[in-house]
Amino acid sequence: FNISGCSTKKLLWTYSTRSEEEFVLFCDLPEPQKSHFCHRNRLSPKQVPEHLPFMGSNDLSDVQWYQQPSNGDPLEDIRKSYPHIIQDKCTLHFLTPGVNNSGSYICRPKMIKSPYDVACCVKMILEVKPQTNASCEYSASHKQDLLLGSTGSISCPSLSCQSDAQSPAVTWYKNGKLLSVERSNRIVVDEVYDYHQGTYVCDYTQSDTVSSWTVRAVVQVRTIVGDTKLKPDILDPVEDTLEVELGKPLTISCKARFGFERVFNPVIKWYIKDSDLEWEVSVPEAKSIKSTLKDEIIERNIILEKVTQRDLRRKFVCFVQNSIGNTTQSVQLKEKRG
């Protein structure tokens, strides 16, 4: 189709080489009239459509994304050619940063319902550059945490080194929906609820004498509980003796509950005590069996191919540790009688 009638938007993604970050493009076609995907009169670049991204039909995935090759080849369907780019409804997600993402991206409705819809498309010229500015050492992260129940804030990474006074007007989106009131480079949240978790996008306009473009950054916001003040507790084994049959295989499970920690480095291991000797046993990898907002339960098993007489003289010790401290639980094997 002819893309010369598409409205054009220029975007800049300046990514940090130090961190993983994502990027999104919205198919920001204007809010349609009832039977059309687009208003006939296009919005001027300064106007913000009332609802972003495009909500032109009941099926929000009713848009098609293409990339325009720089060599003038025909448009390429994004889904077929670019595995690191995912279409989610009307949003295009770039999972990895890199200058190779630079280019022209076009979106338009899949279903052309009227002659007016033929030119109903948006062309986004995306320029991707690594961040070179070392002066802003402490720019906000693209992954930010909000502490549940307390006051928090979300900062726009590309503007976090500027004071509020010199910061340009910012347009914020949460999960693709325009946050109409927010215009500053930092969103303050009175009281954090899990509802505040999500993908936030901040846009501002930068201009030179020739043209203007939108600088965009994406922030993944996670809502968390405060770090635990407790060391982990062992849920299993509870008893310090275990009846076993000699010559039979045996699996002893150690299950421990670890409270939430922002920097989480749980330790769960088995070791054996035999008179004065002590050694760690190489056992299968630990696995998380339950994870909630507040805590995580991790399990690690010790497997004996067959229980020997010598095993009855040993103590099998499960050792668990977090940044607060450690806990142990020892198990003595006892031969089953009768």
């Epitope: 949460k174 927010e182 009281e191 609820y193």
Partner: antibody, heavy 119, light 111 residues
Framework: SLEESGGDLVKPGASLTLTCTAS?????????ICWVRQAPGKGLEWIAC????????TYYASWAKGRFTISKTSSTTVTLQMTSLTAADRATYFC?????????????WGPGTLVTVSS | DVVMTQTPASVSEPVGGTVTIKCQAS??????LAWYQQKPGQPPKLLIY???TLASGVPSRFKGSGSGTQFTLTISDLECADAATYYC?????????????FGGGTEVVVK
């Protein structure tokens, strides 16, 4: 507990200020203090909320913007200023406390104060 | 603003029976929904918050369910003391907005 005061009989076009007073806790803690009204024989209608924590943010139902103003006036009082009152504003006005511990729901209500608008 | 639509407006059931009240939100409010009971001349009383969590002291005969836009309050083994008006409320405190709209109410008559 919470207690509302300031309800009165006023003429159409008049202004009135209602006060919500806390006892047993203070608005220095972080709560959403809200005003809700109920016309005789009708349902509950949310008017506005103020966050009593550091941000001091205020929020209004779209119909209440401009004519109603919620403010925290001390560590134990929140007020609701109402202007250009009409017969449609006749209602019992409740002060209510919400917040994180109840998923934003109102766990504490005042008994209400009656506002009557009549010429 | 979020709009809450509550049905039915009134319901009558015998003692020991079951009442189901529905509440629909005009947009997705996840599980940020509360249910209140109000008796004449009294302020409302919180029954359920976060769609399904019972407030302290509320009997387990009251059950809340649902998420997104569709919510239900079920009162089983009806008692005379359950005769009241019940309201749902959106309790969403978002980024830069508060959505605290109430449903229109449901009057429960216990025969």
């Amino acid at each position: 507990s919470l207690e509302e005061s300031g309800g009165d009989l006023v003429k159409p076009g008049a202004s009135l200020t209602l006060t919500c007073t806390a006892s047993g806790f203070s608005f220095s803690s972080n709560y959403y203090i809200c005003w809700v009204r109920q016309a005789p024989g009708k349902g509950l209608e949310w008017i506005a909320c103020i966050y009593t924590g550091s941000t001091g943010s205020t929020y209004y139902a779209s119909w209440a913007k401009g004519r109603f103003t919620i403010s925290k006036t001390s560590s134990t009082t929140v007020t609701l200023q109402m202007t250009s009152l009409t017969a449609a504003d006749r209602a019992t006005y409740f002060c209510a406390r919400g917040g994180y511990s109840y998923g934003g729901a109102v766990s504490l209500w005042g008994p209400g104060t009656l506002v009557t608008v009549s010429s | 603003d979020v709009v809450m639509t509550q049905t039915p407006a009134s319901v009558s059931e015998p003692v020991g029976g079951t009442v189901t009240i529905k509440c629909q939100a005009s947009e997705d409010i996840e599980t940020y929904l509360a249910w209140y009971q109000q008796k004449p001349g009294q302020p409302p009383k919180l029954l359920i918050y976060r769609a399904s969590t019972l407030a302290s002291g509320v009997p387990s005969r009251f059950k809340g369910s649902g998420s997104g836009t569709q919510f239900t309050l079920t009162i089983s083994d009806l008692e005379c003391a359950d005769a009241a008006t019940y309201y749902c409320q959106c309790t969403l405190y978002g980024v830069n907005f508060v959505a605290n709209a109430f449903g229109g109410g449901t009057e429960v008559v216990v025969k």
